[in-house]
């Protein structure tokens, strides 16, 4: 047969879809691969085709499309499962051709169970909330295509195993869930139940939203340094060990890159000749600000580490800070080398 | 200098109607969620509603929701609690409050004096 | 609703002795609790925050401590102007409450 472009496994689509629920999956040829869409690739007579491989198995086979009450079926560039089963897990491929042009790509598809407090081995999407801003709205996600919109499905909302009801400051509106002031007890998995008919019979939608409440935009500031600072001084006699921390303080900003570095003399640390040990701690506050600790630390100080300028930066999205450490000689009444 | 000052309290009659006001200097106001607080005479402090800084989040305590309504304006540095309905059991001294989750109320106003009596 | 509950309601001490008051909430406020203090005829004044972080201007001899449910706000040398009602207040959970209030007078 003609050759085929084969875009092999697509291992950025980690599809995980729940047991016995329905599941519609999308060919990803067209939104990730091919420049056209899949009318354009059908009016131009290319068919779609689905294969899979079953977990644990090398063999491809096809998809049975002839099970009772059309379990899976196809329709357009969406594969359908009403509803799935944990062995439907395996790789899964679509393959568009007709007699002179074939292109082809894998995915996997995992089916997960959930026990009945929505526990799973399911990855969920991350919300992330400003602590004590107005109103946060998350909306039950990836619930389009499912049912037309003359079907007006139930929805219910749980905090974890609790289904939200009369929750002070969390209000259920449909596929929305509004956060009135969140606060960090506002942290947790959110799960939106969506029931819905269809041919007769009853269909579940569950997903999850983990809620993280973090620092506002409002209290955003650039890095504060703690250490060094200008109260402590490093008094070293030559041979003994120099240990100074450089602490630092970033309040969270979204999508902020945290910086914290050493320069001694105005190098960088690997641009000097002296043996250096620079090690690094992050922790976070409840709200994901961050505390970032670089300890910098010579085994054996030289009178001349000792006259050196060590300086701790640090850099956000808002600013940059800078803290020289006081660094002087046991004995030396002063932090200047001394002139005899 | 934080300052808070409360203004507007009095005597109403059951079910009349009370507008307070809390005037905030000496902070940025619009970085703080507010709060009204009170003390009914010779009991503890309950609190009654808050509001984001940025003025759309509001909540209430059960006692009193449907019928108070906490509003501000962030160019006037001014907090309001409209109070409609009053009932005998609000009458109270009312406390505006400066919140923040990371110091609770670190400010306090003194206080305006509600009474609800026929 | 989280309930929060103080005891004792009046503690009777001398000047110069400590004081330990006890706050309990009815399920995990983490380390989200304040501790204010009313005297009579003025509104109430923050002392601990973060269950056991002393405001700005407190006296050293105010502290506290605790997490989760039991918190103790401890006066270690009890002066003259500490006589008054300290309140407890939990700001983890909507809606905000506060204990009942303990009363410390002069022995």
């Known amino acids: 047969s003609e050759r085929c472009d084969d875009w092999g496994l697509d291992t950025m689509r980690q599809i995980q879809v729940f047991e016995d629920e329905p599941a519609r999956i999308k060919c990803p040829l067209f939104e990730h691969f091919l420049k056209y869409n899949y009318s354009t690739a059908h009016s131009s007579g290319l068919t779609l085709i689905w294969y899979w491989t079953r977990q644990d198995r090398d063999l491809e086979e096809p998809i049975n499309f002839r099970l009772p009450e059309n379990r899976i079926s196809k329709e357009k560039d969406v594969l359908w499962f009403r509803p799935t089963l944990l062995n439907d897990t395996g790789n899964y491929t679509c393959m568009l051709r007709n007699t002179t042009y074939c292109s082809k790509v894998a995915f996997p598809l995992e089916v997960v169970q959930k026990d009945s407090c929505f526990n799973s081995a399911m990855r969920f999407p991350v919300h992330k909330m400003y602590i004590e801003h107005g109103i946060h709205k998350i909306t039950c996600p990836n619930v389009d295509g499912y049912f037309p919109s003359s079907v007006k499905p139930s929805v219910t909302w749980y905090k974890g195993c609790t289904e939200i009801v009369d929750f002070h400051n969390v209000l259920p509106e449909g596929m929305n869930l509004s956060f009135f002031i969140p606060l960090v007890s506002n942290n947790g998995n959110y799960t939106c139940v969506v029931t819905y008919p269809e041919n007769g019979r009853l269909f579940h939608l569950t997903r999850t939203v983990t809620v993280k409440v973090v620092g506002s935009p409002k209290d955003a500031l650039p890095p504060q340094i703690y250490s060094p600072n200008d109260r402590v001084v490093y008094e070293k006699e030559p041979g003994e060990e120099l240990v100074i921390p450089c602490k630092v303080y970033f309040s969270f900003i979204m999508d902020s890159h945290n910086e914290v570095w050493w320069t001694i003399d105005g190098k960088k640390p690997d641009d000097v000749t002296v043996d250096i040990t620079i090690n690094e701690s992050v922790s976070y506050s409840s709200t994901e600000d961050e505390t970032r600790t670089q300890i910098l630390s010579i085994k054996k100080v030289t009178p001349e580490d000792l006259r050196r300028n060590y300086v701790c930066h640090a850099r956000n999205t808002k600013g940059e800070a800078e803290q020289a450490a006081k660094v002087k000689q046991k004995g030396n009444g002063c932090t200047e080398p001394m002139t005899l | 200098e934080v300052q808070l000052l409360e203004s507007g309290g009095g005597l109403v009659q059951p079910g009349g109607s009370l507008r307070l006001s809390c005037a905030a200097s000496?902070?940025?106001?619009?970085?703080?969620?507010m709060n009204w607080v009170r003390q009914a005479p010779g009991k503890g402090l309950e609190w009654v509603s808050a509001?984001?800084?940025?003025?759309?989040?509001?909540l209430y305590a059960d006692s009193v929701k449907g019928r108070f309504t906490i509003s501000r304006d962030n160019s006037k540095n001014t907090l309001y609690l409209q109070m409609n309905s009053l009932r005998a059991e609000d009458t109270a001294v009312y406390y505006c409050?400066?919140?923040?989750?990371?110091?609770?109320?670190?400010?306090w106003g003194q206080g305006t004096l509600v009474t609800v009596s026929s | 609703e989280i309930v929060m509950t103080q005891s004792p309601a009046t503690l009777s001490v001398s000047p110069g002795e400590r004081a330990t008051l006890s706050c309990r909430a009815s399920?995990?406020?983490?380390?989200?609790l304040a501790w204010y203090q009313q005297k009579p005829g003025q509104a109430p004044r923050l002392l601990i925050y973060?269950?056991?972080t002393r405001a700005t201007g407190i006296p050293a001899r105010f502290s506290g401590s605790g997490s989760g449910t039991e918190f103790t706000l401890t006066i270690s040398s009890l002066q003259s102007e500490d006589f008054a009602v300290y309140y407890c207040?939990?700001?983890?959970?909507?809606?905000?409450?506060f204990g009942q209030g303990t009363k410390v007078e002069i022995k």
């Open positions: 409050a400066r919140f923040r989750y990371y110091t609770a109320f670190d400010y």
């Open positions: 000496g902070f940025t106001f619009a970085e703080y969620a």
């Open positions: 509001i984001s800084y940025d003025g759309e989040g509001t």
């Open positions: 399920q995990s406020v983490s380390s989200n």
């Open positions: 973060g269950a056991s």
């Open positions: 207040q939990q700001y983890n959970n909507w809606p905000w409450t």
